[in-house]
Structure formats: structure tokens, C-alpha cells
């Protein structure tokens, strides 16, 4: 697994413990919480990152304050169960035996139940809408420049194949990034749109998951793009199953 060999760190995930104890003294990195070996040449799965976050040092919460323009939204933080590949298990339960089904990005997609609840398969989130509102600027950003910059960001920073960035919409001050990735489209080695969206969300909050990189310094033609609100919507290949009671509440 690719890790920075000289000082044995994981460039793509700072929530890891790395040691030169791999084969032949090679640097090997394991995710906090799960202890699973991670591939430091690509993004770590959201499930392993959430699990790591639950067991990270308290300093990770007290010393990293969300950036001034990041609204603290409901993170949906819980200690998830991940499968051997690092993906979310379809059924998640808490310590009090309350269970629910999740999609591939770990978001609840059914009502909560007990241990008898069945989640037959992990339903794929194939469409993610990232809604951003930027801080006021002298004028609107040029749409094509903004589009190019955000596509470059997802390609270079998150290693997401450009074909999965379906569209970038802009109506000042709102930006909407559409990520699409069907099961059939995702080849081995492709970064998952859910993982890319999670890294982006943490970057926007000033809580970068990358080792040794500051937060995002997003610029469009030299003009800083500062995000003051983020909302992320997830659409699954199979619609979620919530009771009408919840939908009318």
C-alpha cells in the first residue's frame, strides 16, 4: 500500500497509524478504530473514516475547529460496522440494539427497528447533489471557470474520474455539483463518489483528512471561493423505505 516511505505516513488519511512493519520494512498504515490496512494511494472509504473519527484522540475534535464559514450541520455521526472491504454493512445497530438500514454512503434509508430488522443488500447511492452557497463577492464567478476549477479539484485532489462529475450548476451565490456513478459504471480502482463527497465535505469545513495538507484554498481565476453553507443530498438506486408517519411529521 502506497505510503510516504521516508517518514511513514499516509498522505490520503491522517486518521491512521503507520509503521515500517510491512513486508521488507515497508510502511504500512492502518485506520484508527478498525485497525484495517488502508491503501494510501487513494481515498479511504467513508465507513472506515467514520469509524476512525469515533476513536480518534479528543484533540482531533478540540483542536480542529470548523472554519469560520462552515456551518456545523448534522453530521449523522455514529460508530459504523464496516465490511472487510471497508464498505458500510447494510444493517447498522447501536449499543441499545436499535437497528436501521443504510445506503452505500452510510445514510439511514429505513425507519429504525430492532435486531429482527433485515437489510437484504447495501443499496448504492448513485447520485449525489452537493449544494454550496459562497460568500458574497464583487461579482458573480464566470460559470465555465467555476465549472473547470471544481472539476479539476475533484480530479486532482480526490482522484475522482471526470466522467463522474455530471454537472456543475451556478446561480449566484448557489453552486450545485452533481456526482453520478452507477454500479455498472464503477470499475475496480475508481474512487467512489460517496468517498469523494465526504472528503470534500470535510475539506469545506476546514477539517481536511489529508495528511500534511492545509484546508481547501479554492480560487477561481485568482478570486477566493469561500463556502458559507453546504448541503448534501443523496439519491439511491432503490428509493428509501420510510413509513408515511415519518414523511408527514
Amino acid at each position: 500500500h502506497t505510503a510516504a516511505q521516508d517518514n511513514c505516513t499516509c498522505p490520503t488519511n491522517k486518521m491512521t497509524v503507520c509503521s515500517p512493519d510491512g513486508p521488507g520494512g515497508r510502511c504500512q498504515c492502518r485506520a484508527l478504530g478498525s485497525g484495517m490496512a488502508v491503501d494510501c494511494s487513494t481515498l479511504t472509504s467513508k465507513c472506515l473514516l467514520l469509524k476512525a473519527r469515533m476513536s480518534a484522540p479528543k484533540n482531533a475534535r478540540t483542536l480542529v475547529r470548523p472554519s469560520e464559514h462552515a456551518l456545523v450541520d448534522n453530521d449523522g455521526l455514529y460508530d459504523p460496522d464496516c465490511d472487510p472491504e471497508g464498505r458500510f454493512k447494510a444493517r447498522q445497530c447501536n449499543q441499545t440494539s436499535v437497528c436501521w438500514c443504510v445506503n452505500s454512503v452510510g445514510v439511514r434509508r429505513t425507519d429504525k427497528g430492532d435486531l429482527s430488522l433485515r437489510c437484504d443488500e447495501l443499496v448504492r447511492t448513485h447520485h449525489i447533489l452537493i449544494d454550496l452557497r459562497h460568500r458574497p463577492t464583487a461579482g458573480a464567478f464566470n460559470h465555465s471557470d467555476l465549472d473547470a476549477e471544481l472539476r479539476r479539484l475533484f480530479r486532482e485532489r480526490y482522484r475522482l474520474h471526470p466522467k463522474f462529475v455530471a454537472a456543475v450548476h451556478y446561480e449566484q451565490p448557489t453552486i450545485q455539483i452533481e456526482l453520478r456513478q452507477n454500479t455498472s459504471q464503477k470499475a475496480a480502482g475508481d474512487v467512489d463518489i460517496g468517498d469523494a463527497a465526504y472528503y470534500f465535505e470535510r475539506d469545506i469545513k476546514g477539517e481536511s483528512l489529508f495528511q500534511g495538507r492545509g484546508g481547501l484554498d479554492l480560487r477561481v481565476r485568482g478570486e477566493p471561493l469561500q463556502v458559507e453553507r453546504t448541503l448534501i443530498y443523496y439519491l439511491d438506486e432503490i428509493p428509501p423505505k420510510f413509513s408515511m408517519k415519518r414523511l408527514t411529521a
Epitope: T16, K58, L63, R213, G214
Partner: antibody
Framework: QVQLVQSGAEVKKPGASVKVSCKAS????????MNWVKQAPGQGLEWIGI????????TYSQKFQGKVTITVDKSTSTVYMELSSLRSEDTAVYYC???????????WGQGTTVTVSS | DIQMTQSPSSLSASVGDRVTITCQAS??????LAWYQKKPGKAPKLLIH???NLQTGVPSRFSGSGSGTDFTFTISSLQPEDIATYYC????????FGQGTKLEIK
Amino acid sequence: QVQLVQSGAEVKKPGASVKVSCKASGSSFTGYTMNWVKQAPGQGLEWIGIINPYQGDTTYSQKFQGKVTITVDKSTSTVYMELSSLRSEDTAVYYCARGAGLYYFDYWGQGTTVTVSS
Amino acid sequence: DIQMTQSPSSLSASVGDRVTITCQASQDINKYLAWYQKKPGKAPKLLIHYTSNLQTGVPSRFSGSGSGTDFTFTISSLQPEDIATYYCLQYDDLFTFGQGTKLEIK
């Protein structure tokens, strides 16, 4: 190769202030936290405070609150520690240390001796 | 604030001896403990992080173990160049060093 280079030794009178610098090179400056650690003569190591160069946020040990101010100049990849109202007990070697991803200190400066004497 | 109690404060051993230093935290710090070697006039050097993970380039005679509140640092076969003061550091909730253990050759 990561390097933290600190400013030279200082001799100050009681009541004065001193500003020690720590210049980082060899890695992304804003991607790591920076800490200051004190070692008084014949004593152990004491953590003073931390700064996140990306946002400029600081957190201080309760013991050094009001005594120390940590600042950053991102343009020169330099972190500063200012000690005010100096007293003889501030005589020590002060180290800057980089916080790794999980915050333990992986690289250290060479140390700066501050002597407070009338 | 978390207190770290390190013992012994000083220790005399012969070359080739097995040396053990302990550190006790006043509350659970998971495995967020590092060990440093400090020689006079030199900056501290990171030996071990996350309780037992050897920093790159550090000889394998150094090791660490423990979890929660009780931690141990071991030098399996003392070498002359190991003469130094050793410190533990908890980095779970802010940062606290142990008082240090001065290691001398008999």
C-alpha cells in the same frame, strides 16, 4: 526533509518580552500544527501551546495562559512565540515541534535558550 | 487536565541489560501515548507513537506496550548510545509529558 529552524539565544531583563521564531521547510506548512515546549534548567519537558497555521487557531496550556502568545506568518512559513513580563522562572530552552496528523510531535527545532537576568 | 506519572525518575543499568520504564495516565488515553529520547543540548527525538509504533529509523530494541492508563517502554538490550532521559507524552486530550526517566550506565 522536514526542518524547523529556530532563532538564536536571547538574554532579557525581568519585565521585558521576547519573541522566538521557528521557520519550517521541507513539507506543507499549513498542513500540520505547530507546538511550543519548554525545558527549564534541570527540569522536564512542558507543553506550552499549539497553533493551527491554516486557520491561525491557538490553544494554550492553562499554566501559560496570559504569559505566551503564539502567532503565525504563512507567507514565510514561520511560527512565533512571544513571552511577556519575563521573570527568572522563564529562563529555559524553548522548542518548537511539529504535530503529526494525530498530533504527537514528530519533528523538533534545535531549541532557543532564553535567559532572564537582571 | 491529564496527569502522567512516569517511573522510575532515574535508573542505572549495564550494557546489554533489559530496561523498563512505566507511565501511568490519570485517565483513559486509549493508545495515544508517545515516547521520546532527550540528550543534553539536543532536541527530543520521537521513538514510538500510538503506544507501540516504532518511528522510522528507530532501532527495534526499543518497544512499547499498554492501553488505557498503563504503559510500558522497554529497551531490550541497552547500548551505550541509549544513555539519555526518556519522556512519555499523552496526546489524547491536549498534551502532557511524564516527569522523565534519567538512564545511566552502571
